[in-house]
């Protein structure tokens, strides 16, 4: 008799990463019967959502519905129609949110409000819209590349199916730089962690974990733009600001009112004599990299070692795959490759930098100008802030691995989310026994 | 200050019902959505529904649609839970939170269906 196909016993879950540059929508698929296993979710599709991230719309909350339509509409099509009300869809909102609400409560939560309103009209099971902490925002990105990376996995294995797998169980430390805020996380060695804010415990597969973690609000790429640029406005003449972080000829009016629009720039306040300036690019790395060292304050530290800014950091530990803004800017400049030296990274910024404006706008003709014009200061800032900031050298520098995708999934919080949401983590190693055996075939 | 102080939890059997009210002040309260979330021993935290700042609007998840409802008196800054046909599944530690908020700033109220 002929075998026929059963239908496959699948489950799907829905995260939005609301971040402060853009809403990217992240489905993922997994097989029921095996829930408890790891590394058995995976990503099926990604949807960026087309415009800037939700707390943009604080002025136009009526357009938050039709704005998150298109990938919806994607879920819609990609899940099939009878798992859609048993598929959980969860909003998280990172630090672009978080910024709103320092600035003002009641309007981050109209955002919130029209948000949930309109995710609550499509036929999945919405489970909330809420801001997550940058401790979580660091946790789950740890969870998920270790996941990914098969580091949770009690099996040992003669054999790598990921890249990266070093074959032990050494986690891997988690870099995460987003447009508004920037984590840190890793497992310590033998370190006592000394703030307590820092601490993270988890027992995960049967396993402890003692985790440290650290979220620097205002450290994304965009808003240490900003602060750059209110720093470095503050000491010019007029209203020319010649910035070594654009390329030379590059030239940008930025308005007053936008650079002190975010609470990250407040600490650099001051009445200006004009209304607009003119940023002029001079391309200069080294100026450029000075100029971002003056964000990090190292003077302070109340601890035995600090990162900057008096935030206490362990000495690094391991590996650490770098993801989100980290990965797409070394991407673009095509330095993500294990054989680029830190010395190597640094000699093809500098020349990256120096390249005249028309010529990298010939050279990049299909790359939007907005996007184009800053990765001489992303490239730099990055930099800045593995060496300075968190203390990799030329030789840890091998250490840091970038990561965009790992098995076809993303790197970056969601997956974690989702798998501690869903309660897909144990705390205990499921265990293998002669009648559930095939469970886990 | 802030603070939110859950209560109306209990023992109850499947089937029976409960209201649960949180008192909130140090904030305005008419001017934040509000919400409740659960947690099981053991689970992870889950958003029980939210209801927004002038109490016009609802939502809920699927598994207690129809049968929890989320209210609230602006005038008394209360909060409520109205949960009727009550299940083993809706036993756990229930919290109110400000929307707004990452995480449940109250102590919780326990709330167990069983027989």
């Known amino acids: 008799t002929q075998n026929k196909a059963l239908p496959e016993n699948v489950k799907y879950g829905i995260v939005l990463d609301a971040g402060s540059s853009h809403t990217s929508l992240y489905i993922y698929k997994w097989p029921a019967e095996k829930e408890n296993d790891t590394g058995v979710v995976h990503q099926v599709e990604e949807c960026r959502v087309k415009g800037p991230g939700i707390s943009k719309f604080v002025q136009k909350v009526n357009e938050i519905g039709i704005y998150l339509t298109d990938c919806m509409e994607r879920a819609r099509e990609v899940i099939p129609r009878s798992q859609h009300q048993e598929t959980p869809v969860y909003l998280g909102a990172t630090a672009g949110m978080r910024l709103l609400r320092m600035e003002s409560e009641e309007l981050a939560d109209r955002v919130l409000d029209v948000v949930e309103r309109s995710l609550s009209n499509y036929p999945f099971d919405f489970q909330g819209a809420r801001i997550i902490t940058g401790q979580e925002e660091g946790a789950y990105g740890w969870i998920t590349i270790n996941y990914l990376l098969g580091k949770f996995s009690q099996k040992t294995r003669w054999f790598s199916i990921v890249p990266y797998e070093t074959n032990n169980q050494e986690t891997f430390g988690a870099l995460d730089l987003g447009g508004a805020s920037t984590q840190v996380t890793f497992v310590p060695q033998n370190q006592t962690i000394e703030s307590p804010d820092n601490a993270l415990q988890f027992r995960l597969y049967g396993k402890d974990y003692n985790v440290y973690t650290h979220s620097f609000l205002c450290y994304g790429k965009d808003q240490a733009l900003w602060q750059k640029l209110a720093k470095d406005i503050q000491v010019a003449s007029n209203e020319i600001l010649r910035d070594p972080c654009f390329h030379p000829g590059y030239k940008k009016v930025v308005n007053v009112s936008d650079l002190y629009k975010t609470p990250c720039t407040k600490r650099f306040e001051m009445t200006l004599p004009f209304q607009q300036f003119e940023i002029q690019g001079i391309g200069n790395y080294q100026q450029c990299h000075q100029s971002i060292l003056e964000l990090f304050n190292t003077s302070y530290c109340p601890y035995s070692q600090c990162a900057f800014n008096g935030i206490f950091l362990p000495p690094l530990q391991g590996d650490f795959g770098a993801f989100s803004a980290f990965y797409f800017v070394m991407k673009f400049l095509n330095l993500t490759s294990e054989k680029v030296s830190q010395e190597k990274v640094t000699e093809m910024m500098k020349k990256f930098c120096a390249q005249p404006w028309e010529e990298i706008k010939t050279s990049y003709a299909g790359v939007k100008e907005k996007y184009l014009s800053e990765y001489c200061f992303s490239g730099t800032y990055i930099l800045s802030l593995l060496l300075q900031g968190y203390h990799f050298t030329a030789d840890s520098w091998e250490h840091i691995h970038f990561i965009g995708k790992i098995q076809g999934s993303d790197a970056g919080w969601t997956l974690g989310y989702m798998l501690n949401l869903t309660n897909m983590i144990p705390a205990e190693q499921p265990l293998s026994t002669p009648l559930s055996h095939s469970t886990y075939v | 200050q802030l603070q939110l102080v859950e209560s109306g939890g209990g023992l109850v059997q499947p089937g029976g019902s409960l209201r649960l009210s949180c008192a909130a002040s140090?904030?305005?309260?008419?001017?934040?959505?509000m919400s409740w979330y659960r947690q099981a021993p053991g689970k992870a935290r889950e958003w029980v529904g939210s209801i927004s700042a002038s109490g016009d609007y609802t939502t809920y998840q699927n598994s207690v649609k129809g049968r929890f409802t989320i209210s609230r008196d602006n005038a008394k800054n209360t909060l409520y839970l109205q949960m009727n046909n009550l299940k083993p599944e809706d036993t756990g530690v229930y919290y109110c939170t400000r929307r707004v908020d990452s995480y449940p700033r109250g102590q919780g109220t326990q709330v167990t269906v069983s027989s």
């Open positions: 140090g904030f305005t309260f008419s001017n934040l959505g």
